[in-house]
């Protein structure tokens, strides 16, 4: 094929590629007709002037996962057709300014993964056509003013996984057809007013792992096309009351693990597209009425390992479409009875680990399609009759590791769960823990020399379990997990994240890795 | 572009197990649902389980717990269905899936691995 | 766990005419604002393709002579000119619960 070197590999469609850690220059001659060429795991440590001069229909170039260190300024000399660079997962720490010149068709440039300390204006002034930008996994600290200003049709930039301390008002304001930014892990304190408003066109801003701690009130007022905002693993302590109020396509919205302490009355929306709501791991201790009105499609909201100590009975107002609610590892004392009446849908609810002492009748009563409840590890002595008898859906409950208090007036309860026992699980049972002369048998078997009233009893479904709700401890002693967990929903075990140390959430529950495009 | 590559056709012998993978690409891994997906040979749908890669959490059909393991590897963008004890009525192509939110319809499907289990 | 019937089975139509599907529910998955049921094309030796999500939406890049409709237990999708390319098999899906599909429907060229 026009001579192909015999370090590498070259196939009838043009493409070449050459691997191995023999490889310590690139290898020539290239094929002449060559349109793609892959230099992949060598032991390359510089690229000299003019490489590819002789294969100038060049249209994609990866010089990936080599050895890398030193570029000469007109080591791509010759190559106007290269629409896709990449040399990422390398060694650079330097770019040579003017490196990129000439490269007028190039769209895509794929920096990503090496040591780069610092770009310049310079660095990309010529790349007027370039679409995708990836500098992440290097160890910028900062990016100068006027860095991207020529990129103007630059489409998705990446600065992920750097050293930023601070960004400047002015660095993306020319970048007006950008759909996608991404700062995350990142040492960011604050984001300056205004740093967003050229960007029209963002649908997805990710600013997870930083240490953000204030969000200016009207940061993302001209990104009402932003899809996807991802605010997790920050120190937001609080929320601006307009801060979300202009972004109607929102579709994904994390605001995990941070430091927030109280949510206003309709901060979130309004937000048709918005599904799931993830806060866990804040320092939220109550919720007010109204607090989540907006979000009428959401599906799942994760308000788990909080400090939630009271709720008003009109916090959950408008989330007609809501199936998961996890409340689980919280302050929650006592519970309002019309708390949850709007919930018509809610199909899972867990409240483990939390301070209940009681619940009252009616707690359950326009929520008839639940399936699972969590109610382990409480103070909860009894529970009220008929609390559980019109839920005919209902197939796990969780009981065990309350204070159960089994003198005469826990036979309804009782005889409730003889009949139910399938709805239990076999993990755990409830056990009694006064008087002490029953303390640590099982609930369900234990004799109580009462007689026994009759009580309604709502025929078991047929399924004891379905897999949505398995029988996983919610509170595992284990402080590590593994990808194997199995998670009960997002709303139990999902957030159930008691298995990680705060620690290690940083790195846990980040993109990451996975997020390397 | 979303794109869900699976690996290739598997022979294996009664009692065997078996690891299907789902290279995802094209999408940030971690924030989404991953499905899979049973069609035994000139059968319908059939509903395994889920996985939601941010932390590995999973959902399972009961009629496959136990029998079906889903895992993730964050680093490589991977999904894993690890099939194990398998029976003559494993033999199936299965697929992986994308889905936005845990009740969503699936948007994006992997190409299916064929699994045939015959002594 | 919630059973789908699909009807027919199969379907012969002509090219250009009006192809129905049904698909029943045992119970319903529909709130006030949504029905949980999705639809699916699938072509020999492809996988399944989403066509229609939460009943009515078009999933982007479909054609618009595909249409989903129903709410409750009862569901339809509607080819309303069929073309040589729809010659498939269409299932149903729920995810109200544990999800399942429908047995399917298979549509041939009359």
């Known amino acids: 094929y026009h001579g192909c070197p015999s370090e590498c590999t070259c196939s009838r469609a043009s493409q070449v590629e050459c691997t191995g850690a023999r490889i310590v220059a690139v290898p020539t001659p290239l094929p002449w007709n060559a349109m793609s060429l892959q230099i992949l795991n060598t032991h390359i440590t510089e690229l000299n002037e003019s490489p590819f001069l002789n294969i100038s229909a060049l249209i994609a170039l990866r010089i990936e996962k080599n050895e890398l260190s030193r570029i000469t300024p007109g080591a791509f000399r010759n190559l106007g057709s290269l629409r896709y660079l990449s040399l990422a997962n390398n060694k650079l720490q330097v770019l040579p300014i003017g490196l990129f010149q000439g490269l007028d068709s190039l769209e895509s440039l794929l920096l990503s993964s090496n040591q780069l300390l610092q770009i310049q204006p310079a660095h990309f002034s010529q790349c007027s056509n370039l679409k995708e930008l990836q500098l992440h996994g290097n160890h910028l600290e900062y990016i100068p003013d006027g860095a991207f200003d020529h990129l103007v049709g630059l489409t998705k930039l990446n600065l992920g996984k750097n050293s930023l301390t601070h960004i400047s008002p002015r660095v993306f304001q020319h970048l007006g057809n950008l759909q996608v930014l991404r700062l995350y892990e990142n040492r960011l304190t604050d984001i300056p007013m205004g740093t967003f408003d050229g960007l029209v066109n963002l649908q997805e801003l990710a600013l997870q792992q930083n240490q953000i701690g204030l969000l200016s009130p009207g940061l993302f007022h001209n990104n009402h096309n932003l899809q996807r905002l991802y605010l997790s693993n920050n120190h937001i302590s609080q929320l601006p009351p307009s801060v979300f109020m202009q972004l109607p396509q929102l579709n994904r919205l994390t605001l995990f693990g941070n430091s927030l302490k109280e949510l206003s009355p309709g901060i979130f929306g309004p937000m048709p597209n918005l599904r799931e709501l993830w806060l866990y791991d804040n320092h939220i201790s109550s919720l007010p009425d109204n607090v989540f009105s907006n979000l009428r499609q959401l599906q799942v909201l994760i308000l788990s390992r909080n400090q939630i100590s009271f709720i008003s009975p009109g916090a959950f107002n408008g989330l007609t479409e809501l199936r998961e609610l996890s409340l689980h590892t919280n302050a929650l004392q006592d519970l309002d009875g019309n708390v949850f009446r709007m919930l018509a849908n809610l199909q899972n609810i867990s409240l483990q680990n939390n301070r209940l002492r009681q619940l009252p009748g009616n707690i359950f009563a326009n929520v008839n399609g639940l399936m699972a409840i969590q109610l382990q590890n409480n103070q909860l002595e009894n529970l009220p009759l008929g609390i559980f008898d019109h839920l005919g859906k209902l197939c796990e409950l969780r009981l065990y590791d309350n204070p159960w208090r089994c003198d005469s007036d826990i036979l309804p309860l009782r005889n409730w769960l003889l009949l139910n026992q399938p709805r239990l699980g076999t993990d755990t049972v409830p056990v009694c823990f006064s008087p002490a002369n029953v303390r640590g048998q099982s609930l369900i078997i234990i004799n109580v020399n009462v007689a026994v009233p009759s009580v309604h009893v709502p025929e078991v479904p047929s399924y004891p379990e379905t897999p949505w709700y398995p029988d996983t401890p919610s509170y595992p002693d284990t402080t590590s997990v593994s990808s194997t967990t199995e998670l009960t929903s997002p709303v139990e075990d999902y957030t159930d994240l008691t298995t990680i140390q705060v620690t290690d959430d940083r790195s846990v529950w980040g993109m990451t890795q996975a997020q390397s495009g | 572009e979303v794109q869900l590559v699976q690996s290739g056709a598997e022979v294996k012998k009664p009692g065997s197990s078996v690891k299907v993978s789902c290279k995802a690409s094209?999408?940030?891994?971690?924030?989404?649902?991953i499905h899979w997906v049973k069609q035994a040979p000139g059968q319908g749908l059939e509903w395994i389980g889920l996985?939601?890669?941010?932390?590995?959490?999973?959902n399972y059909n009961q009629k496959f717990k136990g029998k079906a393991t889903l895992t993730v590897d964050t680093s490589t963008t991977t999904a894993y269905m690890e099939m194990s004890s398998l029976r003559s009525e494993d033999t199936a192509v299965y697929y992986c899936?994308?889905?936005?939110?845990?009740?969503?319809?699936?948007?994006?499907w992997g190409q299916g691995t064929t699994v045939t289990v015959s002594s | 766990d919630i059973v789908l019937t699909q009807s027919p089975d199969s379907l012969a139509v002509s090219l250009g005419e009006r192809a129905t599907i049904n698909c029943r529910a045992s119970?319903?998955?529909?709130?006030?604002?949504?029905?949980?049921m999705h639809w699916y094309q699938q072509k020999p030796g492809q996988p399944p393709k989403l066509l229609i999500k939460y009943a009515s939406s078009l999933e982007s890049g479909v054609p618009d002579r595909f249409s989903g409709s129903g709410s409750g237990t009862d569901f339809t999708l509607t080819i309303s000119s069929l073309q040589a390319e729809d010659v498939a098999v269409y299932y149903c899906e729920q995810s109200w619960e544990i999800r399942t599909f429908g047995g399917g429907t298979k549509v041939e060229i009359k």
């Open positions: 119970q319903s998955v529909s709130t006030s604002s949504y029905s949980y």
């Open positions: 094209g999408f940030t891994f971690t924030d989404y649902y």
């Open positions: 996985v939601y890669p941010y932390i590995g959490g999973t």
């Open positions: 899936a994308h889905g936005d939110n845990k009740y969503d319809a699936m948007d994006y």
